[in-house]
Amino acid sequence: QTDMSRKAFVFPKESDTSYVSLKAPLTKPLKAFTVCLHFYTELSSTRGYSIFSYATKRQDNEILIFWSKDIGYSFTVGGSEILFEVPEVTVAPVHICTSWESASGIVEFWVDGKPRVRKSLKKGYTVGAEASIILGQEQDSFGGNFEGSQSLVGDIGNVNMWDFVLSPDEINTIYLGGPFSPNVLNWRALKYEVQGEVFTKPQLWP
């Protein structure tokens, strides 16, 4: 376990070999979750890229947060995708939080502390627990089959995950840098493995 506070993983160039694998202590399927993170890239007007890829043996796009060029954020649960359109692209560090719950299928997507309109996805589904969680690449199969054209070039950090839906107040607290206790992925006690050319550097966001 490593305390990654105020640090970020840096992916300096496009590749299909550089990634970070995160280890999560999941023992049972997820009926809800929240993922929050920071990232910083210049790619958004150039091509799509993977932000957070959670694959199971049954479904490579079990949870996927992806930037789709010309559209905006793509959010996938169990292979089913919805989009959160972004009309104007700016180059700046971005904080995102996204949550999903099985009971209602409701998805929340927050960008820099501001909520997008809620949408619905995969009501009644459960997310598999035996997962390969990858930063820097999009998994087209469990733990692999990467495409360089989907890789992240830039920084990612403060990756935290919960097995429940955070309240709006909690998400606001996280965005503002307040205290929180993630129970699936914890950036302050992170188990991870680096493959390829990935560097750990001080974070560039406040």
Partner: nanobody
Framework: EVKLLESGGGLVKPGGSLKLSCAAS????????MSWIRQTPDKRLEWVAT????????YYSKSVKGRFTISRDNAKNTLYLQMSSLKSEDTAIYYC?????????LSQGTLVTVSA
């Protein structure tokens, strides 16, 4: 094995209409959002439109919004793209895709040529 087979392309005059179809097999079609992308004569890939798995949400690129309509029939495992008020710049090979992250041709595509 995932298979996507597009059809319905052809030669059409500016201002005309066409309806493209994409027959899907090898996966549970109703579980997936589906997209149309196109490859222009200069080989650029452009996203055109996306429809969510349950027909709940549709999304369009600025260049086709108001002229194209994406739809699907989950019972027939088929995706559609109704194209109207076609312009010469709509000339392209049109591909259907299972996910917007699959931003590269996965199938044969169908050629649409808009010319007087």
């Amino acid at each position: 094995e995932v298979k996507l087979l597009e059809s319905g392309g052809g030669l059409v005059k500016p201002g005309g209409s066409l309806k493209l179809s994409c027959a899907a097999s090898g996966f549970t079609f109703s579980d997936y959002g589906m997209s149309w992308i196109r490859q222009t004569p200069d080989k650029r890939l452009e996203w055109v439109a996306t429809i969510s798995s349950g027909n709940t949400y549709t999304y369009y690129s600025k260049s086709v919004k108001g002229r194209f309509t994406i739809s699907r029939d989950n019972a027939k495992n088929t995706l559609y793209l109704q194209m109207s008020s076609l312009k010469s710049e709509d000339t392209a090979i049109y591909y259907c895709s299972r996910h917007t992250s699959d931003y590269y041709p996965l199938s044969q595509g169908t050629l649409v040529t808009v010319s007087a």
